[in-house]
């Protein structure tokens, strides 16, 4: 496959594995209320995320509300949200550093410096991977020792929620793209040949007579 | 099982200080605040402060000059002390646990009832 | 500070009645209340929060409304276990603020 291909695909796979971990950063369903306890008067769900929780009631109605206070916060719950928006202002970053070292702009005089800046734009998607996937695990590690742990009462056991899956697959894409773009990068180094294949030559320059090549005219 | 169980003298003399433990079982202080109110007949139920679980601090303005509220993770203990206490002081003082990112009192202790008297 | 005000100190009821318990802050809370219940001799325990949030465990007889400055805790039909004081407090900034208490007595 051709180094811009490679660019494509993996530029694609960031920016699709962007807008994941932006919805999942956003989505109040990082923990979900276990139901384990049948006895529970009036079963209602509970969802937790990084900005809001929400409560579904047994009738279906749902109110949801941002937190009162980032100091109400846990103190994961307040470094998730630091990672989470660091790695998406980071793919922000990554995504202008992607495009000036891609070979179908011209931000960068094509050559060794741009598909330098091609390769950090990969390694950014990588790193921004890297970095949505700390609070990803941490939270789900918490999430899980609590709902094993004999301590916690049943009423405070969560589940897993759908945003930690969402999350989970946007670095996974995040890091393949990145993975691509730094592929991509390589060969376009290694492999001149493999390169983007528009190639442009310049106009034909007239003789030094003046005259042009007679099979321009008709 | 959630619980905040309170320790402290029941009578304090005039001027003095009062300090309250509250040690709390089945979650962990790394995870929720703790807030501090108190009830007389008086005044009924005064928000005094909450010590939140990353470890700052806020207060009712109208006691922050004698009021200091710290905690001890590794033993699940919030410590509350007010300083110059008076008559008007008389009350139960409770902790609570703050619902999770909200200003919230969810479960309160079994109370400490002081009395300000020499 | 926010003031909430609690304009019935007592409210006589039998059991099988609804009751509403009513509850005004002096400026709008954008539905940042909570209700709670004490009984004699007992802590305060929380029944809803967010104005209309149940909280875990409390029967569907508590229903909670309003918005702006006015709130209403609502008991759809009173049980002889129901009858205690019942305190509003607003969320919406510190300090947190309480009422003054409604004391739910039979009639």
């Known amino acids: 496959m051709g180094s811009a291909a490679l660019e494509i695909l993996g530029l694609v796979l960031c920016l699709v594995g962007w807008g994941g971990l932006i919805l999942a950063c956003g989505l109040p369903m990082w923990q979900v209320t276990a139901f384990l306890d049948h006895n529970i008067v009036t079963a209602q769900t509970t969802w937790k995320g990084l900005w809001m929780s929400c409560v579904v009631q047994s009738t279906g109605h749902m109110q949801c509300k941002v937190y009162d206070s980032v100091l109400a916060l846990s103190t994961e719950v307040q470094a998730a949200r630091a990672l989470t928006v660091g790695a998406v202002l980071l793919a922000f970053v990554a995504l202008f550093v992607t495009l000036a070292g891609a070979q179908c702009t011209t931000c960068v005089a094509p050559g060794p410096a741009k598909a330098r800046v091609a390769l950090t734009g990969g390694v950014l998607y990588l790193l921004c991977g890297l970095l949505a996937l700390v609070p990803l695990c941490w939270f789900a590690n918490i999430v899980v020792r609590e709902f094993y742990d004999p301590s916690v009462p049943v009423s405070q056991k969560y589940e897993l929620g759908a945003a930690l899956y969402i999350g989970w697959a946007a670095t996974a894409l995040l890091m393949v793209g990145g993975g691509l773009l730094c592929c991509g990068a390589w060969v376009c180094t290694s492999r001149p040949d493999l390169s983007f294949p528009v190639k442009y030559s310049a106009p034909r320059r007239p003789t030094a007579t003046g005259d042009y090549d007679k099979k321009n005219y008709v | 099982q959630v619980q905040l169980k309170q320790s402290g003298p029941g009578l304090v003399q005039p001027s003095q200080s009062l300090s309250i433990t509250c040690t709390v079982s089945?979650?962990?202080?790394?995870?929720?605040?703790v807030h501090w109110v108190r009830q007389s007949p008086g005044k009924g139920l005064e928000w005094l402060g909450v010590?939140?679980?990353?470890?700052?601090?806020d207060y009712n303005g109208a006691f922050k000059s004698r009021l200091s509220i710290s905690k001890d993770n590794s033993k699940s203990q919030v410590f509350f002390k007010m300083n110059s206490l008076q008559a008007d002081d008389t009350a139960i003082y409770y902790c609570?646990?703050?619902?999770?990112?909200?200003?919230?009192?969810?479960?309160w202790g079994t109370g400490t009832s002081v009395t300000v008297s020499s | 500070d926010i003031v909430m005000t609690q304009s019935h100190k007592f409210m006589s009821t039998s059991v099988g009645d609804r009751v509403s318990i009513t509850c005004k802050a002096s400026?709008?809370?954008?539905?940042?209340v909570a209700w709670y219940q004490q009984k004699p001799g007992q802590s305060p325990t929380l029944l809803i929060y967010?104005?209309?949030t149940r909280h875990t465990g409390v029967p569907d007889r508590f229903t909670g409304s309003g918005s702006g400055t006015d709130y209403t805790l609502t008991i759809s039909s009173v049980q002889a276990e129901d009858l205690a004081l019942y305190y509003c407090?607003?969320?919406?900034?510190?300090?947190?603020?309480f009422g003054a208490g409604t004391k739910l007595e039979l009639r």
């Open positions: 010590k939140w679980s990353g470890g700052s601090t």
């Open positions: 967010w104005a209309s």
């Open positions: 400026q709008d809370v954008s539905t940042n």
């Open positions: 609570a646990r703050g619902l999770d990112g909200y200003y919230v009192p969810d479960v």
């Open positions: 407090q607003q969320h919406y900034s510190t300090p947190l603020t």
């Open positions: 089945g979650f962990s202080l790394i995870r929720y605040g």
